[in-house]
Interface confidence: medium
């Protein structure tokens, strides 16, 4: 699809290309799974065009068909962790509020691994926000290149 | 400055307990995962346990897995070694140590340790 | 448990001269997580190298790590009379966390 000439003068936020890359900042206390992004130019090479962050988590200001990714690499680990530490640790992607449209969009299991990654295809409206839940008892890398978390608008 | 300063190390008899603490200052003491690493007189190093800056995820080698309990209290900026049923081989200078910013286990400070006998 | 085997067990050199340091893993390590860490007698380790090449603040060009998988070495370039210690190496990509058993850097 063209662009119209007066399309070609507006900020890709208005055209609805909302885009997003965090790194990791740090993880929950205690009783709390969560992950906890950030994202800016002075952190390297993560940042935020359109979706905006709160406490952490990842907020959608456009309505639109997303493509969600995610990698998370621990730091901690071992190829027999799962057993060693009793509880098998698992990464889950979902909306977390509003509590109306709370789901979950990914969950994988490390098992014997150290890595995991997925991505999937989404809506996710105004409003959505997004939270990252690692459970169990090992670590997560804050390393840039081991871990990160984005989303990018495709389509209405 | 990053500070460790470790203590509660002496002599004790097979079977009994001791508890060590690590005094930290000069960071942000919650924000950093712990260990214990120990070194019997002329022997190697020995990663010992691991904490992570909330104290919500701990580790253990095997040799003292079941016997020994890390812990931390970020209020105080302390951590702790709670050592039960001790043996013999547990003999050594227990030294704190603090990890890096990433969560990765290496150990980028430590303290200059707290000796642990352990005798009849 | 990966078991690092550090050679040679002393290393007889005088000042000035070129040091290598060997640490051998039992199985790949991960990501390279490998670090290198130096003991002088009645003191604690202080770090050295880390992610087996990276030098840590305040360390020395004249300290440099490198080597992939199983194989690591610690290069001293030209030994200074403070750099005579027991050095080091330890993997942190895989639980336990293991040390090598060391190698004395003593003066001929």
């Known amino acids: 699809q063209r662009l119209s000439r007066a399309q070609q003068q507006l900020p890709l936020e208005s055209l609805g290309w909302d885009i997003a890359e965090l790194q990791l900042n740090h993880t929950g206390p205690q009783q709390d799974p969560r992950l906890y992004w950030q994202g800016g130019p002075a952190l390297g090479r993560s940042f935020l065009r359109g979706p905006e962050l709160d406490k952490g988590q990842l907020r959608i200001r456009r309505d639109g068909i997303y493509m969600v990714h995610i990698q998370v690499t621990l730091a901690i680990c071992s190829s027999t962790s799962t057993s060693r530490h009793h509880h098998p640790t698992t990464l889950a992607v979902g909306i977390c509020s509003p509590a109306s449209r709370s789901i979950s969009l990914l969950r994988l299991s490390f098992h014997q691994g150290c890595t995991i990654a997925s991505q999937r295809l989404t809506p996710l409206a105004r409003g959505d926000t997004l939270c990252t839940n690692l459970t169990g008892t090992l670590l997560p890398s804050r390393n840039t290149d081991e871990t990160f978390f984005g989303v990018q608008w495709v389509r209405p | 400055e990053v500070q460790l300063l470790e203590s509660g190390g002496g002599m004790v008899q097979p079977g009994g307990s001791l508890r060590l603490s690590c005094a930290a200052s000069?960071?942000?003491?919650?924000?950093?995962?712990m260990s214990w690493v120990r070194q019997a007189p002329g022997k190697c190093l020995e990663w010992v346990s691991a904490?992570?800056?909330?104290?919500?995820?701990?580790f253990y080698a095997e040799s003292v897995e079941g016997r020994f309990t890390i812990s931390r209290d970020n209020s105080k900026n302390t951590l702790y070694l709670q050592m039960n049923s001790l043996r013999a081989e547990d003999t050594a200078v227990y030294y704190c140590?603090?990890?890096?910013?990433?969560?990765?286990?290496?150990?980028?400070?430590w303290g200059q340790g707290t000796l642990v006998t352990v005798s009849s | 448990e990966i078991v690092l085997t550090q050679s040679p067990g002393t290393l007889s050199l005088s000042p000035g001269e070129r040091a290598t340091l060997s640490c051998r893993a039992s199985?790949?390590?991960?990501?390279?997580?490998l670090a290198w860490y130096q003991q002088k007698p009645g003191q604690a380790p202080r770090l050295l190298i880390y992610?087996?090449?990276s030098r840590a603040t305040g360390i020395p060009d004249r300290f440099s790590g490198s080597g992939s998988g199983t194989d690591f070495t610690l290069t001293i370039s030209r030994l200074e009379p403070e750099d005579f210690a027991v050095y080091y190496c330890?993997?942190?990509?895989?639980?336990?966390?293991?040390f090598g058993c060391g190698t004395k850097v003593e003066i001929k």
């Open positions: 904490i992570s800056g909330s104290g919500g995820r701990t």
């Open positions: 199985q790949s390590v991960r990501s390279n997580y």
């Open positions: 140590a603090k990890h890096d910013y990433s969560n990765y286990p290496y150990f980028d400070y």
């Open positions: 992610g087996a090449s």
């Open positions: 330890q993997q942190y990509g895989d639980l336990p966390f293991t």
């Open positions: 000069g960071f942000t003491f919650s924000s950093y995962a």
